[in-house]
C-alpha cells in the first residue's frame, strides 16, 4: 500500500531570464527511491537514478542543472518555459509517486512564490 506523500513547491513564478529551483520531497514512506524523473508535459528533462546518478536530456543541457538534492534548477528562463512540471518518484516496493509544479515565467519584475501544497 502506498503511504507516502509528495510535497512540492506548488505554483511558482519567476522572471524571464532568471532561474528557478523545482523541488519535490517524498515523505511518510520507508520505500527506497530508485529513480526520480523530471518531466515537462511530454518531455523528459532529467533523471536522477540511484545507481547511475544524474542525466540531463541533451536538448536541455544548456539550461538545466541537477539539484539541489533531487530537485532541478532551470536557468535562462523564457516565457515558453511556462507550464506544468512533474517529479516522478520511482520507489520500491511502493511503486510510483507523482508531484506537480506549475511554473509561470513573467515578463515583469514581479514574481512571487505560491504556497506549498501536497499531492497524496
Amino acid at each position: 500500500m502506498m503511504t507516502g506523500t509528495i510535497e512540492t513547491t506548488g505554483n511558482i513564478s519567476a522572471e524571464k531570464g532568471g532561474s528557478i529551483i523545482l523541488q519535490c520531497h517524498l515523505s511518510s514512506t520507508t520505500a527506497q527511491v530508485t529513480q526520480v524523473n523530471w518531466e515537462q508535459q511530454d518531455q523528459l528533462l532529467a533523471i536522477c537514478n540511484a545507481d547511475l546518478g544524474w542525466h540531463i536530456s541533451p536538448s536541455f543541457k544548456d539550461r538545466v542543472a541537477p539539484g539541489p538534492g533531487l530537485g532541478l534548477t532551470l536557468q535562462s528562463l523564457t516565457v515558453n518555459d511556462t507550464g506544468e512540471y512533474f517529479c516522478i518518484y520511482h520507489t520500491y516496493p511502493d511503486g510510483t509517486y507523482t508531484g506537480r509544479i506549475f511554473l509561470e515565467v513573467l515578463e515583469s519584475s514581479v514574481a512571487e512564490h505560491g504556497a506549498r501544497f501536497q499531492i497524496p
Epitope: M2, T34, Q35, N37, E39, D42, Q43, L44, I47, N49, A50, D51, L52, H55, S57, P58, I88, H90, Y92, P93, D94, G95, T96
Partner: antibody, heavy 122, light 110 residues
C-alpha cells in the same frame, strides 16, 4: 501514432547468429527503454533484456548473458538484438516492447512490435 | 520454472466474473508494487492490461481490474465477453532487476 516496426522473419542454421531490428516512431526514442521478449511456439513469454537509450544502459537476463547483444541507434530510432550460437530451442517469435514510463527503470510494456519469427533449423 | 505461479487455465460464462491469480515464489518478485498483466490473443502481440498492480492504461476496459494481497496479485475480469478469451500473463519488474513473466493462464469463455 506510436509504433514499433520489426524486421522480417529469419531462417538460420544452428551455430549462426541473427540480428533483429525494431524501428520506433511517434515518440522521443531516447526517453524510453525498449526490451526484447521472446515466445517459443506454444510457450509463454520470456524477457531477454533491454536498453535505455537515455542512459545507454543495457540489461540482459542471466540466461542470455554472453549470447545476446542489445544496441540502439538514436539517429535512426532503432533498437537491435543479436543472438549468437543459435540452437533449435531459440526458434521463437521475438518481440520488442517499449517501457510504459520514460526513463527506463524496468517497467511494464505498453507498446509492442508485431514480432519477428526466427527459425533455427539445419 | 517461473518465479511467478499462475493457474494453467480458468473458464467462465458470458457475463460472469473470473479471477486469475499470480503468486511470487521468490524474494525478487515478492510483495512489491511492480506487477502487471498482459492479454495475448493467438498469433498477436501481448497487450498491457494492468500495471503497478491496479492501474489501467488508457483504452483498457474498466471490466479489467487488478489487486494484490501479500505475494499474490490478481486480475479480475467482470462481465465476461467472448473477446476476453485469450492467454493472460502476469509480470514482475522490480527496479534494476530482471523482468519475469508467469507461465500464462488460458481463459476460456464457455
Amino acid at each position: 501514432e506510436v509504433q514499433l516496426v520489426q524486421s522480417g522473419a529469419e531462417v538460420k542454421k544452428p551455430g549462426s547468429s541473427v540480428k533483429v531490428s525494431c524501428k520506433a516512431s511517434g515518440y522521443t526514442f531516447a526517453s524510453y527503454g525498449i526490451s526484447w521478449v521472446r515466445q517459443a511456439p506454444g510457450q509463454g513469454l520470456e524477457w531477454m533484456g533491454g536498453i535505455t537509450p537515455f542512459f545507454n544502459r543495457v540489461d540482459v537476463a542471466e540466461k542470455f548473458q554472453g549470447r545476446v547483444t542489445i544496441t540502439a541507434d538514436k539517429s535512426t530510432s532503432t533498437a537491435y538484438i543479436e543472438l549468437s550460437s543459435l540452437r533449435s530451442e531459440d526458434t521463437a517469435v521475438y518481440y520488442c516492447a517499449r517501457d510504459l514510463r520514460r526513463g527506463g527503470v524496468g517497467d511494464a510494456f505498453d507498446i509492442w512490435g508485431r514480432g519477428t519469427l526466427v527459425t533455427v533449423s539445419s | 520454472q517461473s518465479a511467478l505461479t499462475q493457474p494453467r487455465s480458468v473458464s467462465g460464462s458470458p457475463g460472469q466474473s473470473v479471477t486469475i491469480s499470480c503468486t511470487g515464489t521468490s524474494p525478487d518478485v515478492g510483495s512489491h508494487a511492480y506487477r502487471s498483466w498482459y492479454q495475448q490473443h493467438p498469433g498477436k502481440a501481448p497487450k498491457l492490461m494492468i500495471y503497478e498492480v491496479s492501474y489501467r492504461p488508457s483504452g483498457v476496459s474498466n471490466r479489467f481490474s487488478g489487486s494484490k494481497s501479500g505475494n499474490t496479485a490478481s486480475l479480475t475480469i467482470s462481465g465476461l465477453q467472448a473477446e476476453d478469451e485469450a492467454d493472460y500473463y502476469c509480470s514482475s519488474y522490480p527496479p534494476s532487476s530482471a523482468t519475469v513473466f508467469g507461465a500464462g493462464t488460458k481463459l476460456t469463455v464457455l
